[in-house]
Interface confidence: medium
């Protein structure tokens, strides 16, 4: 709230508490206050105050417990390096300024690990890994020196232990003591040194979050053998016996927020959406917790490791729940994931042991009741014998996250909850609830499933490329006869589907145009495939003039696509890439996508276009139950098509058929159409089962959408369940298994 | 083996700009930072500020700061130092210099240096 | 800004003697975590760019004669030439690198008597 709108309700003036070079917002209905300073600023010497009961704000203490008469917003600076061992870093500085750069060098016979160019960043930190040089003499390898941290201990032997520290005035995020274990790793995690202006980006927490939940989900065989000194991934088999349980802790204390909570649910949305993507079906507890915690879901029940279900009741939780008593006792929230971890008679079922338990704690601060909660961790590592005994520690089978949103998040405090794994980052602080929004976001959109077909970034700072990050453009140019334009869809790193009525024979590859993802450059084309039934003059002599069975054609492109969030493949139809998206059983067949993506009935789909220079999607149905027939014989209606005596004649049974006024009214193709994608979009995910064809009227004469069309104005789609051995034939090599 | 050849001689008058070039050889440009030194007639070096050619980023000195830009092409592997709103104190001789590795501070390869002559 | 001090300004020694240059700095140079000093010293002939000849304060630069010596740790160092000979007639600067800025002495001219 700006403060000039909002009085505290305490008995704090506002006088005087002002900020040079920035703004402040109060917090907990006046109770606090937080200071703003533009990027690249941060606000001296203290972010937050709070309102004393004397009626006085905190008073402003510096590090050294200097007091402060004004606050400030003062540039921000990255921490130099306190120590570099075995080589050198330049330049060397007292303080270092955004977008300064330092290198790393190591001296002879030592090896550099991590980056050896570093940049600071508006954040404060520096970007890239912790730069080490080792010469692999120790039983580990040296565990480095992390910007900001000292370091005590420089005997790398089995058992031995370095600790950290950081200067006064910041917080120890990670691991204060490391030991050197068998098997070449280090206990615990890198720590860094954290001041409290300091947040993640979304960006850092998405990469490091993906990152080690992937470690969890996607694993691959534990035994897999590794010497001394090497750097070992945590690796887990995902036993086929063995199953996985995601705890959702989700903080609905006063000091949330109704639309913060709101928030929190879309990122776990989100999450169970990005999980289920991955093919593996955990079971899912929900809980959310203010003074008491409460139980939506737990996984026990039949249905929590149904995706959608799970989904359904998590949007369905109210803000409003908590009201009433809205403290934060964190410690209650964890005792009700104890609850639903521990067995009943205390009598262990069988493959207990097998099982992993991921918790997500997601909380905008201070747990103010009920005790410390870490002594619940504990009990939760006891019940699933963590760390007992040293040959099998299982640290593998828990793994707990923990999100701090805002200002008022206690370091100390989310740092002693979340687990701490090599290489792994499990603690995160995010200035707001926007940019835990976009962790998630950009989360479901990591580099990992860039490959994942059908997945967009539907976010509110998306353009019209990360909302459809498959479309293609495509124009011809033809000396002294124009351009035609079309729309194409990506399907893989080297091809691009579209009509193959948008080339002649005569269209020469340097003269066409492709351009993906918005951007200005065309990509340099190889070849342009036809189906080889495709004849638009096929059938001239019976009177039809021209004639469109067939009508896909695939661009192969020269240089391989690099995915991003703006390039991305749709699904096709019969690939195991569509199984995943539509979350069905690995051993569906072809049959059964059939019937999951174009039943016998009206189905809703739709296609892209491009309007004033903007992509909008179109919402169609495609006719494919009662209405197929009349919807097939308004083909006659066509120019050329008039006196075709039986309309089968031109529309084969490879065409699907939208347009028309019922169940509603469909808006219709436009001749730059041509080539796209005829789109149904399920379970958040996007599959192309058509490709734009013709159309019975021409709406866009004018370059202008007519708004009333007639009833009979259908467009045709080639149907790509009709084309799909041409297709497996042609994209044998591009990895997307066909069934 | 190394080599930084710079342009030739300059003179300019007070308020315009110069801009010397350093082109490097006998090695790989991109992997070794560019510093540039100046020195006043009968004076001492003064250390100007370096640029990265691999990333572009530069680090300039406070006292030269909004008044040099460098810039490099790593096409031609060339080094470009620009000073603006040129004083009369600003007549020396300008020299690009190499370190060991990346950004190292020991100046091991020198240009041959540019003057610069400041005069209405 | 680290200001470096070099003394003698000008020094005048016979062919085949020792010549001594000091260089004081404003600040230590002297890493303590790598007992590393950031100094350098560099030869400068009339007409030439400088010459690098010694760095970490006592490191000699390859190809560079052994009278060629630097000692001193911290705050204090010192370039000596152990036996002067015609070619070594130049000005002498040292140079922090422990931050930025890099900076250097004013420069000690040495002559021959």
């Known amino acids: 709230t700006p403060w000039s709108l909002a009085r505290p309700q305490g008995s704090c003036s506002l006088e005087g508490v002002e900020i040079k070079g920035g703004s402040f917002r109060l917090l907990q209905e006046g109770q606090a206050l937080e200071y703003v300073c533009p990027s690249g600023f941060y606000p001296y010497p203290v972010q937050t105050r709070t309102c004393r009961s004397t009626g006085s704000w905190s008073t402003l203490k510096t590090q050294d417990q200097k007091t402060v008469r004004k606050a400030e917003c003062r540039a921000i600076h990255c921490p130099r390096p306190h120590d570099f061992e075995n080589g050198e870093y330049w330049p060397r500085s007292p303080y270092y300024n955004v977008s300064d750069e330092i290198s790393f060098h190591c001296y002879d016979g030592y090896t550099l690990r991590g980056s050896a160019n570093r940049t600071c960043q508006v954040n404060g930190r520096w970007s890239g890994q912790t730069a080490i040089c080792d010469n692999g003499a120790g039983y580990c390898s040296n565990p480095g020196i992390p910007i900001g941290t000292r370091k005590v201990g420089s005997q790398y032997r089995l058992e031995d232990s370095v600790t950290y520290h950081c200067s006064r005035g910041l917080t120890l995020r990670g691991s204060q003591r490391r030991t050197c274990q068998e098997g070449g790793s280090w206990s615990g995690t890198e720590p860094s040194c954290q001041d409290s202006f300091m947040y993640d980006t979304p960006q850092e927490v998405a990469e490091a979050f993906l990152s080690s939940l992937t470690e969890t989900i996607e694993g691959v065989d534990a035994e897999d053998g590794h010497g001394p000194g090497e750097q070992q991934k945590r690796k887990i088999v995902l036993d086929p016996s063995g199953s996985m349980n995601i705890y959702l802790v989700l903080d609905g204390s006063d000091s949330i927020g109704a639309s913060n909570f709101t928030g929190a649910k879309k990122c776990l949305v989100n999450l169970i959406e990005k999980v289920a993507s991955y093919g593996v079906k955990p079971r899912y507890g929900l809980v959310t917790y203010a003074t008491y915690p409460k139980i939506w879901v737990k996984v026990s029940e039949a249905d929590s490791s149904n995706a959608d279900w799970v989904t359904k009741q998590l949007n369905e939780i109210n803000y409003e729940d908590h009201k009433l008593k809205s403290g934060t006792n964190t410690k209650k929230a964890l005792q009700a994931v104890y609850s639903m971890m521990s067995w009943p008679d205390d009598v262990p079922p069988e493959g207990w042991n097998r099982t992993r338990h991921v918790i997500i704690l997601m909380t905008d601060g201070l747990h103010n009741m009920g005790g410390d909660p870490i002594t619940v961790i504990d009990e939760i590592r006891d019940l699933l014998y963590i760390g007992k005994d040293r040959k099998n520690p299982r640290e593998d089978y828990l793994d707990v996250y923990v999100f701090g949103v805002g200002p008022l998040v206690n370091q100390v405090n989310i740092n002693a909850l979340a687990s701490k794994k090599d290489n792994e980052q499990h603690v995160f602080k995010v200035k707001d609830m926007e940019n835990l929004e976009d962790v998630f976001y950009q989360m479901i959109d990591e580099s990992q499933s860039l490959s994942l077909c059908g997945m967009v970034w539907e976010h509110r700072k998306g353009t019209d490329y990360h909302k459809q990050p498959w479309q293609a453009k495509i124009s011809v140019i033809r000396p002294s006869k124009g351009h035609e334009s079309c729309m194409g869809a990506v399907v893989s790193e080297y091809f691009v589907l579209t009509a193959a009525h948008c080339f002649t024979v005569d269209d020469k590859e340097h003269s066409i145009k492709v351009s993906v993802g918005g951007e200005k450059r065309d990509l340099e084309i190889e070849v342009v495939l036809f189906h080889p039934n495709y004849n638009i003059n096929g059938k001239k002599e019976a009177g039809i003039p021209e004639f469109y069975d067939y009508d896909v054609a695939l661009i192969k492109l020269k240089n391989k696509l690099k995915y991003g969030q703006t390039i991305r493949p749709i699904c096709l139809p019969c690939t195991e890439g569509t199984t995943r998206a539509l979350r069905l059983p690995p051993t569906t067949t072809c049959q059964q996508q059939k019937e999951e993506l174009l039943p016998a009935q009206d189905i809703k789909a739709l296609f892209v276009s491009e309007e004033e220079k903007k992509l909008t999607r179109k919402e169609v149905y495609i006719k494919n139950g009662d209405k197929k027939g009349s919807c097939e014989r308004d083909a006659q209606y066509a120019p050329g098509y008039d006196k075709v005596k039986d309309i089968s004649e031109v529309v084969t049974p490879r065409f699907l058929c939208t347009g028309g006024v019922s169940p509603y009214a469909d808006p219709n193709t436009c001749r730059g159409d041509s080539g796209g994608p005829l789109i149904v979009h399920k379970r958040s995910r996007f599959i192309q089962v058509g490709v734009i064809s013709w159309g019975v009227v021409d709406v866009c004469k004018n370059q202008k959408r007519q708004k009333q069309v007639p009833a009979h104005a259908r467009d045709f789609h080639i149907n790509l369940f009709q084309v799909l051995p041409w297709l497996k034939e042609k994209l044998q090599d591009e990895d997307l298994g066909f069934l | 083996q190394v080599q930084l050849v710079q342009s030739g001689a300059e003179v300019k008058k007070p308020g315009a700009s110069v801009k010397v070039s350093c082109k490097a050889s006998g090695y790989s440009f991109t992997d070794y930072y560019m510093t540039w030194v100046r020195q006043a007639p009968g004076q001492g070096l003064e250390w100007m500020g370096w640029?990265?050619?691999?990333?572009?980023?530069?680090k300039y000195a406070q006292k030269f700061q909004g008044r040099v830009t460098m810039t490099r092409d790593t096409s031609i592997s060339t080094a470009y130092m620009e000073l603006s709103r040129l004083r009369s104190d600003d007549t020396a001789v300008y020299y690009c210099a190499r370190g060991y590795y990346a950004n190292s501070a020991w100046f091991a390869y020198w240009g041959q240096g540019t003057l610069v002559t400041v005069s209405s | 800004d680290i200001v470096m001090t070099q003394s003698p300004d000008s020094l005048a020694v016979s062919l085949g003697e020792r010549a001594t240059i000091n260089c004081k700095s404003s600040?230590?140079?002297?890493?303590?975590?790598?007992?590393?000093?950031?100094l350098a010293w560099y030869q400068q002939k009339p007409g030439q760019p400088p010459k690098l000849l010694i760095y970490w304060a006592s490191t000699r630069e390859s190809g560079v004669p052994d009278r060629f010596s630097g000692s001193g740790s911290g705050t204090d160092f010192t370039l000596t030439i152990s036996s002067l000979q015609a070619e070594d007639v130049a000005v002498y600067y040292c140079k922090q690198v422990y931050n930025l800025p890099w900076t250097f002495g004013q420069g000690t001219k040495l002559e021959i008597k």
């Open positions: 600040q230590s140079l002297l890493q303590s975590s790598t007992s590393k000093n950031y």
């Open positions: 640029i990265n050619p691999n990333s572009g980023g530069t």
